[in-house]
Amino acid sequence: EVEKTACPSGKKAPEIDESLIFYKKWELEACVDAALLATQMDRVNAIPFTYEQLDVLKHKLDELYPQGYPESVIQHLGYLFLKMSPEDIRKWNVTSLETLKALLEVNKGHEMSPQVATLIDRFVKGRGQLDKDTLDTLTAFYPGYLCSLSPEELSSVPPSSIWAVRPQDLDTCDPRQLDVLYPKARLAFQNMNGSEYFVKIQSFLGGAPTEDLKALSQQNVSMDLATFMKLRTDAVLPLTVAEVQKLLGPHVEGLKAEERHRPVRDWILRQRQDDLDTLGLGLQG
């Protein structure tokens, strides 16, 4: 905590500028008006303040806004955002996507910190749902964002937002998450033709039920083995050898390399040997 001392004569800051770089902590505390700081927050990011100086500036804002900062200040926090605690952020009401983008930009290139997670949570809760623009923004900064949400949180994602999802955004999703996302994707892409539909739905198929896989097998989609290996075991087991052959197309030969891994292993054990032999791959049930 910086002591309360009078500002030395001639050192009262008329504006936030580089002349403050070399102010000591107590001088910043005594000589920088908090209201001035709040209105000129955008300038702070251009000035090489040290960690310690930023602590003082944050303290001044905390005193000015004990109930939480207004969005006009939050939007221009810049590097000062990295000084905020999750407790600070829980006091905020962030509604503008531009504010969210500005703060995510500050943390760019780093792991999602507790501060960022809290900010996103506040923002999404404030909006009521994870709309397309928000999802677009979040996955651009954090490709794994979607898979960090619980199935319950994912249920608030409207089907229209699914258009913002890229395949890499689903890389770390588990089956429970894909179970929630797949029906939304199916709805979102329902008006697309066969081949285009498959390209879009492919990353979500880890949540697809048996009947949808059967339907896909009738469309010459040539699913690759990587996608097949991510399918739900319980959805794959009822498929016939003929259906799997149609589903995989030329990729069916890859089953041999995966015969010891789920879901291929479990599926093989469910098939009649005669049917497996028709594939000519030497699969043993």
């Epitope: 090489p48 040290t50 310690e52």
Partner: antibody
Framework: EFQLQQSGPELVKPGASVKISCKTS????????MNWVKQSNGKSLEWIGV????????GYNQKFKGKATLTVDQSSSTAYMQLNSLTSEDSAVYYC????????????WGHGTSVTVSS | QIVLTQSPAIMSASPGEKVTMTCSAS?????MHWYQQKSGTSPKRWIY???KLASGVPARFSGSGSGTSYSLTISSMEAEDAATYYC?????????FGGGTKLEIK
């Protein structure tokens, strides 16, 4: 042991540019600002500018704006100063100097890099 | 910008003698820093925040002053103290240095 290891002497032609490096060790590079100071042939010292290695933010002496550009590479804990459009007036020894905690002067200095501008 | 004027520009002292050099600022500053530089080497922080001695600086050195007038004093001159001393302020932007006082041993 804190160290600020500067690049070697430079002999450059008028109008050219030069980039001086200052590799640091022994402390957390991003925790302290880095200053650059000019000393012309044994004369006094002139402050050029300062950079915050954590954010890349800079402050310059008006006299050196457009002449000097300060940058850092966090991965190698190195600060750089580029000097442009060199003239004989720029011939000097240039020092990097770490900013002390809470404005407590410049506590550690590099050994200096001599720049000579001559045709 | 604040101009710092050091005096004298050159001085010499005998071993054991008391030495005082001054630094006058064109406007009031809150703190003064002092650096020692020996020929062919980089400056070293010597006294900071007007009166605090940097690590390794002998106790015979002291600093004082306020406003526009500051000084560095050596209570008893030793041969190793021969060097140029620069004062520096960063109370006002941009930071500035004095022209230096060259201290020689008699």
């Amino acid at each position: 042991e804190f160290q600020l290891q500067q690049s070697g002497p430079e002999l450059v032609k008028p109008g050219a540019s030069v980039k001086i490096s200052c590799k640091t060790s022994g402390y957390s590079f991003t925790d302290y600002n880095m200053n650059w100071v000019k000393q012309s042939n044994g004369k006094s010292l002139e402050w050029i500018g300062v950079i915050n290695p954590n954010y890349g933010t800079t402050g310059y002496n008006q006299k050196f704006k457009g002449k000097a550009t300060l940058t850092v590479d966090q991965s190698s804990s190195t600060a750089y100063m580029q000097l442009n459009s060199l003239t004989s007036e720029d011939s000097a020894v240039y020092y990097c100097a770490r900013g002390g905690y809470d404005g407590e002067a410049m506590d550690y200095w590099g050994h200096g890099t001599s720049v000579t501008v001559s045709s | 910008q604040i101009v710092l004027t050091q005096s004298p520009a050159i001085m010499s002292a005998s071993p054991g003698e008391k030495v005082t050099m001054t630094c006058s600022a064109s406007s009031s500053v809150n703190y003064m820093h002092w650096y020692q530089q020996k020929s062919g080497t980089s400056p070293k922080r010597w006294i900071y925040d007007t009166s605090k001695l940097a690590s390794g600086v002998p106790a015979r050195f002291s600093g004082s002053g306020s406003g526009t007038s500051y000084s560095l004093t050596i209570s008893s001159m030793e041969a190793e103290d021969a060097a140029t001393y620069y004062c520096q302020q960063w109370s006002s932007y941009p930071p500035t240095f004095g022209g230096g006082t060259k201290l020689e041993i008699k």
